[in-house]
């Protein structure tokens, strides 16, 4: 049993025992492993119900995965003196169902935050901004990983989950410096239209494995730094002209569209024309039609306008019952 202050080269990570001594600025909390050399603390799969209070001041990378935290209150990481070095915080798979406003306040160097695999029934609009001001102090966050944070249906609030997440992303315009945002596997049916406008620095956006049917009301126009846009494994049927033009206008972007149920009818003509000339779409020759049945498995790039027909809609007077 020893604290991080008595670290030895033969044991870079030291598990601590509960101690009667007062907390020291560089001691290792109970049920955690610490490496001062690596500036890392790991409290992993220990069924912790709250964030340890006695985290060492040197901590730069903090892993709190696989616990039972349930609620992350305001100031969950606020310490005196503050954890000024903490840059990467991983809380994935810790059974969080509530993240309150100001949960990540007083972490001036926090660049990467991973809340994945927590069933967040409640995510405060001020979880990342820390205040309810219309314009808050900029968050230091550069990478925000929110994969599979959708709660089970019976735990959802009345408001839409998409709306709740969007509110947290845009509050106070705090995340203007965000470069990476992962929102995969969240059952999103739509993307609230204002979200991307508030995240102008995004370089990597992962919306894969959701249930997005359309991007008609989503604007990518101001994401001029975007390099990767992941839309695989959604329910996209077609991309319309407005979306195509916006994507084409982004100077560095690569778009991933695999495993969507493309509907190859007359509405697909513009997208097919665009696919044939764009360099934006990765693996574009692997995009295939899912509907109608007669077109299933056809490669989009190999379609021509004659292939893309729509059944005529008869006027009511000509329809038979």
């Amino acid at each position: 049993t020893s604290s991080a202050s008595s670290s030895s080269s033969s044991a870079p990570f030291l598990a601590s025992a509960a101690s009667a001594q007062p907390p020291l600025p560089d001691q290792c909390p109970a049920l955690c492993e610490c490496s001062e050399a690596a500036r890392t603390v790991k409290c992993v799969n220990r069924n912790l119900t709250e964030v340890p209070t006695d985290l060492p001041l040197y901590v730069r990378n903090l892993f709190l995965t696989g616990n039972q935290l349930a609620v992350l209150p305001a100031g969950a990481f606020a310490r005196r003196p503050p954890l000024a070095e903490l840059a990467a915080l991983n809380l994935s798979g810790s059974r969080l169902d509530e993240v309150r406003g100001g949960a990540f306040e007083h972490l001036p160097s926090l660049r990467q935050l991973d809340l994945s695999h927590n069933p967040l029934a409640y995510l405060s609009p001020f979880a990342f901004s820390g205040s309810n001001a219309s314009i808050s102090a900029p968050s230091p966050l550069v990478e925000l990983i929110l994969n599979h944070i959708v709660p089970p249906d019976d735990k959802r609030q009345n408001r839409s989950f998409e709306g709740m997440v969007a509110a947290a992303l845009v509050a106070g315009r705090a995340l203007q410096g965000l470069h990476l945002l992962e929102l995969a596997s969240n059952h999103f049916l739509y993307l609230p239209r204002d979200v991307l406008a508030q995240l102008p620095s995004l370089r990597y956006l992962d919306l894969s494995n959701n249930s997005l049917v359309s991007l008609t009301y989503v604007s990518f126009r101001n994401l001029t730094h975007l390099e990767s846009l992941h839309l695989e494994d959604n329910a996209l049927k077609v991309l319309h002209n407005g979306t195509l033009a916006e994507l084409q206008g982004l100077p560095h972007v690569r778009v991933f569209l695999d495993n969507n149920p493309w509907v190859c009818d007359c509405h697909m003509a513009d997208m097919v024309t665009w696919l044939k000339q764009t360099g934006v779409v990765q693996g574009k020759d692997r995009l295939t039609c899912a509907f109608p049945e007669k077109m299933r498995n056809r490669v989009l790039l190999e379609l021509n306008s004659a292939d893309l027909d729509c059944d005529p809609i008869l006027p009511p007077s000509l329809q038979t019952s």
């Epitope: 494995n209 495993n259 020759d285 692997r286 899912a290 299933r296 498995n297 056809r298 190999e302």
Partner: antibody, heavy 116, light 107 residues
Framework: QVQLQQSGGELMKPGASVKLSCKAT????????IEWVKQRPGHGLEWIGE????????NYNEKFKGKATFTADTSSNTVYMQLSSLTTEDSAIYYC?????????WGQGSTLTVSS | DIQMTQTTSSLSASLGDRVTISCSAS??????LNWYQQKPDGTVKLLIY???SLHSGVPSRFSGSGSGTDYSLTISNLEPEDIATYYC?????????FGGGTKLEIK
């Protein structure tokens, strides 16, 4: 109707190469991927890779890179798979299938026997 | 690579029985799963695509279900011509991978 007709059985010596063929009829040949699948005696199915005939685009299972090479002849609606440096492990039935999100039509299979 | 596992390698049932064949993936595959039938003469046919869609010409006694990592094929009323080996296959990520197969025999 869609049909995939594969070449007949082959008996080859170790170290040799062989080229199996798969002729497609009944659909727009360039509009669909063609898949190749291996089945060793008493074993299951193993995906080798795929080719998009109109473009020559290919994807290979890492395990078969350097072993299998796909080509296509759009004038005869035929896809070929060449297997090189044959060993007894290559003895199997090889199927071609029309692909994409699923393999909806299959050839009858070509049996390759490698023996000294 | 995604591993596909069919835990039952052979299955014996009587004509008219309801038979269920299961298949599990080593990671979530988003319902991107197909089922194939291979007859004793080597002929292979697609039965079910995208977990539950019946391929044209396939009898309605065949059905598929599942999500995430666990999937199944059900034959509701076993007929003599259903004697075959059944394979699941994922197409969520390259390389495509097949299960080891379940051989169905008549009691």
């Amino acid at each position: 109707q869609v049909q995939l007709q594969q070449s007949g059985g082959e008996l080859m010596k170790p170290g040799a190469s062989v080229k199996l063929s798969c002729k497609a009829t009944g659909y727009k040949f360039t509009g669909y991927w063609i898949e190749w699948v291996k089945q060793r005696p008493g074993h299951g199915l193993e995906w080798i890779g795929e080719i998009l005939p109109g473009r020559g685009s290919t994807n290979y299972n890492e395990k078969f890179k350097g072993k299998a090479t796909f080509t296509a002849d759009t004038s005869s609606n035929t896809v070929y798979m060449q297997l090189s440096s044959l060993t007894t492990e290559d003895s199997a039935i090889y199927y071609c299938a029309r692909g994409g999100r699923d393999f909806d039509f299959w050839g009858q299979g070509s049996t390759l026997t490698v023996s000294s | 690579d995604i591993q596909m596992t069919q835990t039952t390698s052979s299955l014996s049932a009587s004509l008219g029985d309801r038979v269920t064949i299961s298949c599990s993936a080593s990671q979530g595959i988003n319902s991107n799963l197909n089922w194939y039938q291979q007859k004793p003469d080597g002929t292979v046919k697609l039965l079910i695509y995208y977990t539950s869609s019946l391929h044209s010409g396939v009898p309605s006694r065949f059905s598929g279900s599942g999500s995430g990592t666990d999937y199944s094929l059900t034959i509701s009323n076993l007929e003599p011509e259903d004697i075959a080996t059944y394979y699941c296959q994922q197409y969520n990520k390259l390389p495509y991978t097949f299960g080891g197969g379940t051989k169905l025999e008549i009691k």
